[in-house]
C-alpha cells in the first residue's frame, strides 16, 4: 500500500493531525523534498552573517558574511576575520609578515620573497610585507661588456619560489 | 567520510561549568591535533585551545586560560572542552575542528574540517 505523504510535495509536509494531508509549510519554514513529515525551521543570517538568499518554503536560506569578513565551514557556518594585504590570520588574531615574506591578500599566510639568485636573477623591486619581489635581469647581463641587455623577466607566480 | 559531531552546550548561569564533547569519525584520530574555536553573536572565529595528537601539549587563549581544559580520549576517538567559571562573553557557538598535523600549535591555523556547532548560552 503506497504512503499517502509520497504524494506531498517539497513546500508541504504531511500533517498526521489533518488525515495525512498535505499541508503548505508554515512561515520561516522550509521543505526541500516530497513526503516530508515535518517542515525544518529556516536558517537565520544573524549579526556578523547577512542574507544572500532568502528562505523559501522549498529551500533553506543562504548566508554569507558582512564586509571584513568572509565564509568558512559547509555553508558559510562560520566567518573568519579578514586581515589588511601584509599581514596574516594566526590564531591571535592578525600579525603583520615578517620581514622577508609577503601576503597580497586580505586572508592566507605570509609566503616567503622569490629568490631571483636561484634563478640567476637580479632584484629588480625589493619586496615588501604586502608585494613579492620583482626580478630582473641576471647580473651578467648587466655587465660592462654585455653585448646587449635582455628584458625583464615576467615577475614569477607570487611566492613561488623554485624547487 | 571525515565528521566532527559536538555536544553538550546549551543554557547555563554565569559561574557555572558544562563539559563540550566531539566525536570523531573517518579518520586515525590520534593522528591529528585538534582545536576548539568559537563565534560570540555578531562577532568573528575566536580560538579558543588546540592540543597535540597524543595529548601532551596543549595551548589555550587568553581569554580562557586557567577556566577552560581541553583533553581527549585516543580510545574514545572523542575532544573535550570542560568550561569552567563560565562568564556571559562566554556565550557563542562552540567548534571542533580537525587539524592536518599532529602537532599542536597556538599560531597557524591548520584546519581542514569542522563540526557543525554546538551553542553555549551563558545567562541568568
Known amino acids: 500500500l503506497q504512503d499517502p505523504c509520497s504524494n506531498c510535495p517539497a513546500g508541504t509536509f504531511c500533517d498526521n493531525n489533518r488525515n495525512q494531508i498535505c499541508s503548505p509549510c508554515p512561515p520561516n519554514s522550509f521543505s526541500s523534498a516530497g513526503g516530508q513529515r515535518t517542515c525544518d525551521i529556516c536558517r537565520q543570517c544573524k549579526g556578523v552573517f547577512r542574507t544572500r538568499k532568502e528562505c523559501s518554503s522549498t529551500s533553506n536560506a543562504e548566508c554569507d558574511c558582512t564586509p571584513g569578513f568572509h565564509c568558512l565551514g559547509a555553508g558559510c557556518s562560520m566567518c573568519e576575520q579578514d586581515c589588511k594585504q601584509g599581514q596574516e590570520l594566526t590564531k591571535k588574531g592578525c600579525k603583520d609578515c615578517c620581514f622577508g615574506t609577503f601576503n597580497d591578500q586580505k586572508r592566507g599566510i605570509c609566503r616567503p620573497w622569490t629568490n631571483c639568485s636561484l634563478d640567476g636573477k637580479s632584484v629588480l623591486v625589493n619586496g615588501t610585507k604586502e608585494r613579492d619581489v620583482v626580478c630582473g635581469p641576471s647580473p651578467a647581463d648587466l655587465s660592462p661588456g654585455a653585448s646587449s641587455v635582455t628584458p625583464p623577466a615576467p615577475a614569477r607566480e607570487p611566492g613561488h619560489s623554485p624547487q | 567520510e571525515v565528521q566532527l559531531l559536538e555536544s553538550g552546550g546549551g543554557l547555563i548561569q554565569p559561574g557555572g561549568s558544562l563539559r563540550l564533547s566531539c566525536a570523531a569519525s573517518g579518520f586515525t584520530f590520534s593522528s591529528f591535533a585538534m582545536t576548539w574555536v568559537r563565534q560570540a553573536p555578531g562577532k568573528g572565529l575566536e580560538w579558543v585551545s588546540t592540543?597535540?595528537?597524543?595529548?601532551?601539549?596543549?595551548y589555550y587563549a587568553d581569554s580562557v586560560k586557567g577556566r577552560f581544559t581541553i583533553s581527549r580520549d585516543n580510545s574514545k576517538n572523542t575532544l573535550y572542552l570542560q568550561m569552567n567559571s563560565l562568564r556571559a562573553e562566554d556565550t557563542a557557538v562552540y567548534f571542533c575542528a580537525k587539524e592536518d598535523t599532529a602537532v599542536a600549535s597556538d599560531y597557524y591555523y591548520n584546519i581542514d574540517v569542522w563540526g557543525q556547532g554546538t551553542t553555549v548560552t551563558v545567562s541568568s
Open positions: 592540543i597535540s595528537g597524543s595529548g601532551d601539549n596543549t
